[in-house]
């Protein structure tokens, strides 16, 4: 059956609506026209739309779609952005406290090792922070550097305090001896394992959250195709050309159109689901040595234990190092 | 044994945080985030439906627009694309995702792979064989995890983890998001270009 004639044979209602979209009336016909030049709202009879109006409707339809998409993702976007910021800051605070705990341990138990120990501890935790934020640093290197740097100070200040401060040559020998003689036992390796596991997990957790933001931002700012624009225009605006201002699109029709427009976006679904489930699995495993909070805040204690281990074996070590580094020590006393 | 007197806190504001018993730890905050994220697990598959429900669609009206004509809401014509001869929806779907979408899918695949490899194997949280040689006497037990915090009575208990810090206690409840009152849907007031 032919559509009912426009209730207003003068296109007055259409004009007053269109004026809100586009001030200036020159695009709206005074009275219904054949509309043979229309490409989207193909008329079955006289129409109150012109080609220019149709273009404006298409533009508006695509804009509406973008706004709807942004509104749809707002809650999710806020959730991830806020949490990414919170966790990043929380991790930095944990690192800061871990550094403070470790410095305090040195100050209380080994005051003669400060301020050198403070410097090494500070550098170590700087690398921890940088690693979490994605820097290409090797955890084993930073743990090795910590113990390599600490041992000469421990030896010259705690175990053999008679050596002069200027004993630079013996430092070279002591650094080498640290690993050769395993002076800290298995503690460096233990710390490497705990720190690398907990930091790796922390780093990937932050990376995953930041990628989540990127995913939402990408789909949030999609530009819809011309074909989609036409479909949306026909669904939302073509009825106006017939003067049907109060009519709304059918629900099923809307779903079909949206699925067409969002076919590409919906392809993300499978990987998005997997992303959330994989992230859940990761989070479920973030405890004990996979929990940086637990590992880093306990590090001062493990370092303390490692120094106690050196002290426990001091007699044996001093004799061995005395022989091993004899040449260096003699040079110092000349 | 090592001890940690509180007067040595370099960052004083932490003092009031470290002993708050009822604040969340980071791990509980992580789990809370996952629970909230899981409510968005169908976000992308549900998008078309979400957008339809938040844009003008005939709900209580008898008649609705099918792209070409006015039809009864429950008729077969209501779900059909009124101008199916003009644009092929199947063709639109066959075009495949935009390059930016393909790129983001690749990134998601990559992070998913990383997350899977990083996920802790079930049943065992740690590697038993830390080193070929066993610990010497006086070292930790063979479970490397036991090495955390074993230095005597005065030791700060690591189990009492850093509480989720006061300065970070943003309220993450989404109800408080500015402009995110779920009752005020775009259908009602957000998209000014719809005039019904």
């Amino acid at each position: 059956q032919p559509p009912p004639p426009p209730p207003d044979a003068t296109c007055h209602q259409v004009r007053s609506f269109f004026q809100r979209l586009q001030p200036g009336l020159k695009w709206v016909p005074e009275t219904p026209v054949p509309g043979s030049d229309l490409q989207v709202c193909l008329p079955k009879g006289p129409t109150c739309c012109s080609r220019k109006m149709e273009e404006k409707y298409q533009l508006t339809a695509r804009l509406n779609m973008e706004q709807l998409l942004q509104s749809a993702s707002m809650e999710l976007k806020f959730l991830i952005i806020q949490n990414a910021a919170v966790f990043q800051e929380a991790f930095e605070i944990v690192v800061r406290h871990a550094k403070n705990y470790t410095n305090a341990m040195f100050k209380n138990n080994y005051p003669s090792l400060t301020p050198q120990a403070f410097e090494f501890v500070g550098e170590f935790f700087t690398d921890v922070s940088l690693y979490i934020l994605g820097s290409d640093i090797n955890v084993d290197d930073m743990v090795n550097e910590l113990f390599d740097s600490l041992f000469p100070v421990i030896y010259t200040q705690l175990m053999n305090p008679g050596l002069p401060d200027s004993a630079l040559d013996i430092n070279e020998c002591l650094r080498g001896a640290r690993r050769d003689l395993k002076v800290f036992g298995n503690f460096p390796k233990l710390i490497m394992t705990q720190v690398s596991k907990s930091l790796q997990v922390t780093r990937i957790f932050l990376q995953a959250l930041n990628l989540g933001i990127e995913v939402i931002n990408t789909t949030d700012h999609l530009k819809f195709s011309k074909d989609c624009g036409r479909m949306l225009t026909r669904m939302w605006y073509c009825s106006y050309c017939q003067g049907l201002m109060m009519v709304k699109p059918c629900g099923g029709y809307c779903n079909v159109v949206m699925q067409g427009c969002m076919a590409g976006v919906v392809e993300i679904d499978k990987y998005w689901r997997e992303y959330i489930l994989s992230l859940e699995e990761l989070v479920n495993g973030m405890y004990r040595i996979y929990d940086m909070e637990n590992v880093l805040l306990g590090l001062f204690s493990t370092i303390h234990d490692s120094i106690q281990y050196v002290q426990k074996n001091a007699g044996k070590l001093t004799t061995t190092i005395g022989k091993l580094c004899a040449h260096s020590q003699q040079r110092q006393y000349r | 044994s090592a001890y940690y007197p509180e007067d040595l806190f370099i960052d004083k504001k932490v003092l009031k945080v470290a002993h708050v018993e009822h604040e969340e730890t980071l791990s509980s905050r992580r789990r809370e985030l996952i629970q909230k994220l899981k409510s968005f697990i169908s976000f992308y598959s549900a998008l078309p439906g979400y957008i339809c429900s938040h844009s003008p669609v005939a709900e209580n009206d008898t008649l609705c627009w099918n792209g070409q004509e006015l039809v009864e809401r429950y008729s077969q014509k209501a779900a059909r694309n009124g101008m199916k001869n003009q644009f092929n929806l199947h063709e639109l779907k066959m075009k495949g995702p935009e390059p930016v979408v393909s790129q983001i899918i690749d990134k998601l695949k990559h992070i998913n792979q990383l997350l899977r490899t990083m996920s802790v194997p079930k049943g065992r949280v740690l590697d038993k064989n830390l080193d070929e040689e066993g610990f010497e006497s006086g070292d930790c037990g063979d479970d490397e995890d036991e090495c955390i915090g074993g230095s005597g009575d005065g030791m700060m208990k690591v189990k009492n983890q850093l509480r989720f810090l006061a300065e970070l206690a943003y309220d993450l409840d989404v109800d408080d998001v500015p402009g995110n009152n779920q009752q005020a849907t775009p259908k009602d007031n957000e998209i000014s270009t719809f005039h019904n």
Epitope: G122, T126, S129, D140, N144, E145, R175 | -
Partner: antibody, heavy 120, light 112 residues
């Protein structure tokens, strides 16, 4: 005392690779990193890369595809290799020991330098 | 990359004079950890560079106390209180706050 001695050819053709060996004494490669730097009249001093005590390496991003640094701890030797050298790679190449903390360190002892001319 | 600019290019002095060399970086060398990784080297004629000062103001082992370093952020200075003959050569500043490490173009200290 700490010493770094360099050896390598002075003249290299673009088709060959540029290889220099740095032999160290007075310290162990298992506890110190070794950097490579070059100096040319046109570019001044330019940091090329480093090999750490663990064997891990860091390179200058501009040259990463052409550089390789390896070492033999037991022989106290570090090996620097640059593939497809060009004329503007002609320079004096230095190895130097890392002092300070890893990549935030400095070179506290330097080799004597190897003058390299790339010419066809 | 961080660009290090040294002034002057050449500094003619008489022995016993004070000398001052300036080094400016294109971005701040203050690391997020509070340290500044700015170092000074001296290269005598026909020799390899030698470390003089590390982290702005710390003299390396064996370096005489007539050498002092100062500055912060992007502006740094090396001072020699009384120039001696062995101090002649080219002075380089270098930074390791940012990767890659970069060096200044050098300042040649020579006799007037």
């Amino acid at each position: 005392q700490v010493q770094l001695k360099q050896s390598g050819p002075g003249l290299v053709q673009p088709s060959q690779s540029l290889s220099i060996t740095c032999t160290v004494s007075g310290f162990s490669l298992t506890s110190y990193g070794v950097h490579w730097v070059r100096q040319s009249p046109g570019k001044g001093l330019e940091w090329l890369g480093v090999i750490w005590s663990s064997g891990n390496t860091d390179y200058n991003a501009v040259l990463i595809s052409r550089l390789s640094i390896k070492k033999d701890d037991s022989k106290s030797q570090v090996f620097f290799k640059m593939n497809s050298p060009q004329v503007d790679d002609s320079a004096i190449y230095y190895c130097g020991r890392n002092g300070g903390w890893l990549l935030r360190g400095f070179m506290d002892f330097w080799g004597q330098g190897t003058s390299v001319t790339v010419s066809s | 990359d961080v660009v290090m600019t040294q002034t002057p290019l050449s500094l003619p002095v008489s022995l016993g004079d004070q000398a001052s060399i300036s080094c400016r970086s294109s971005q701040s060398l203050l690391h997020s950890n509070g340290n500044t990784y700015l170092h000074w080297y001296l290269q005598r004629s026909g020799q390899s560079p030698n470390l003089l000062i590390y982290k702005v103001s710390n003299r390396f082992s064996g370096v005489p106390d007539r050498f002092s370093g100062g500055g912060s952020g992007t502006d740094f200075t090396l001072k020699i209180s009384r120039v001696e003959a062995e101090d002649l050569g080219i002075y380089f500043c270098s930074q390791s706050t940012h990767v890659p490490w970069t060096f200044g173009g050098g300042t040649k200290l020579e006799i007037k």
